[in-house]
């Protein structure tokens, strides 16, 4: 991980400076590196019962570096800490621990939740939604004309998605029944949601004039040409069908 690891190369007296390996400036047979070349960090590695000095380009995991005027030194972080700013402040915990305000914890405190990606304790975030947008135009089967009762909808946006332990979001759309001043569809006004879309022929069973659904007929003030019962409507449909068939046989 860290280059320039210097160790003793051959047998020498305890304080001999020649023959040091890698980044060592001075070394001994028993203790390894005693000091390092410029810009390298001095760290003590425990090997069995003794500590050996090594010189590294940066401090290893579990250590932090201090650049003194005469030596760059690696110091051990607390046992549960992988990366730290100093002895008091951990910045990344070892596996199985969660970081909270510079400390490593088994579990996050009340009111916080564990982020298993960053391994930090974070505030629980609840869902936040915007105000409702205005209601949409009253429509029925995608049309804004030719009926009296339809539905209208309104939506709101999610401003803040919740975290794992946060409150779930409330519904973001709402639909309700609505009533409009019933009007005939104008020519070319039969398209979905009031969009202009001309049709060459009415679909099978469709009349050129808007026919309100039976529910809206019950409460509407009917004009004479719409005073038809269901049987009469059925008859007309059959007649229309026959007309279209006869037209096609002529050709």
């Amino acid at each position: 991980q860290n280059a320039s690891r210097g160790r003793r190369q051959r047998r020498m007296h305890p304080n001999v400076s020649q023959g040091c390996q890698g980044g060592c400036a001075t070394c001994s047979d028993y203790n390894g590196c005693l000091s390092c070349k410029p810009r390298l960090f001095f760290a003590l590695e425990r090997i069995g019962m003794k500590q050996i000095g090594v010189c590294l380009s940066s401090c290893p995991s579990g250590y932090y570096g201090t650049r003194y005027p005469d030596i760059n030194k690696c110091t051990k972080c607390k046992a549960d800490c992988d990366t730290c700013f100093n002895k008091n402040f951990c910045t990344k915990c070892k596996s199985g621990f969660y970081l909270h305000l510079g400390k490593c914890l088994d579990n996050c405190p009340e009111g916080l939740e564990a982020n298993n990606h960053t391994m930090e304790c974070v505030s629980i975030v609840h869902c936040e939604v915007s105000e409702w947008n205005p209601w949409s135009p009253c429509t029925k089967k995608g049309k804004t004309c030719g009926f009296k009762r339809g539905t209208e909808t309104r939506v709101r946006e999610i401003i803040q998605h919740p975290s794992a332990k946060g409150n779930l979001c409330p519904p973001t759309n709402e639909t309700r029944k609505c009533t409009v001043q019933r009007k005939k569809c104008q020519k070319g006004e039969r398209g979905k949601k009031g969009r202009e879309r001309k049709r060459k022929k009415p679909n099978k069973g469709e009349s050129k004039e808007a026919i309100p659904d039976s529910k809206s007929l019950e409460s509407s003030k009917e004009i004479p040409e719409q005073r038809e019962n269901k049987q009469q409507q059925k008859k007309r449909k059959v007649q229309d069908k026959q007309k279209s068939v006869s037209v096609s046989t002529v050709h």
Partner: antibody, heavy 116, light 107 residues
């Protein structure tokens, strides 16, 4: 609870000496480098000197080198600053602080006034 | 030595304001920056370490950012107790050096 209590401040004439002490409790004193930071009246913070956790090395700002001596007694959890040849520009509140890259713990400070 | 330059040196603001203090290092100091708050007659108190990490007990309205040479301390919504002097300090290497301070006053 971490506590650092400074003592030994006072009014002294230029050229005279003063010895500041700092008694530490509530943390493992022998694990920490210790420092003195001073603040002249109405001015900012200025690092003065640091001594390594085991007392083996000391570092000073240029303006106090050769005049101030920093020492510690880990058995007594106490830090000392011997100030000799004091000058008017040494007038400040002197804070004792645990120094581990940042200054994590601070004392309440002791005032040193150098005046004739 | 690494020079630390803070700006502004003083700042007037009102409760509820968002305030930003900047600190400029004379050389690259990675994220080795600390912020302190000092109130009159009191010792400084460590607020933020490693440029952006909040010390235990520091309100979340304080935040720090930056890397290399440019650093910022932000107070999102000033509270009456936040009126104080703020100092940055580089912890990259000895000798430790502080910015000259930013005095935050009530408008």
């Amino acid at each position: 609870e971490v506590q650092l209590v400074e003592s030994g401040g006072g009014v002294v004439q230029p050229g005279r000496s003063l010895r500041l002490s700092c008694a530490a409790s509530g943390f493992t004193f022998s694990d920490y480098d210790m420092a003195w930071v001073r603040q002249a009246p109405g001015k900012g913070l200025e690092w003065v000197a640091t001594i390594i956790y085991d007392g083996s090395r000391t570092y000073y700002r240029d303006s106090v080198k050769g005049r101030f001596t920093l020492s510690r007694d880990n058995s007594k959890n106490t830090l000392y600053l011997q100030m000799n040849s004091l000058r008017a520009e040494d007038t400040a509140v002197y804070y004792c602080a645990a120094h581990d890259r940042s200054f994590d713990y601070w004392g309440q400070g002791t005032m040193v006034t150098v005046s004739s | 030595d690494i020079q630390m330059t803070q700006s502004p040196s003083s700042l007037s603001a009102s409760v509820g304001d968002r305030v930003t203090i900047t600190c400029l290092a004379s050389e690259d100091i990675s994220n080795d920056l600390v912020w302190y708050q000092q109130k009159p007659g009191k010792a400084p108190k460590l607020l933020i370490y490693a440029a952006s990490r909040l010390q235990d007990g520091v309100p979340s309205r304080f935040s720090g950012s930056g890397f290399g040479t440019d650093f910022t301390l932000t107070i999102s919504s000033l509270q009456p107790e936040d009126f104080a002097t703020y100092y940055c300090q580089q912890s990259y290497k000895y000798l430790p050096t502080f910015g000259q301070g930013t005095k935050l006053e009530i408008k």
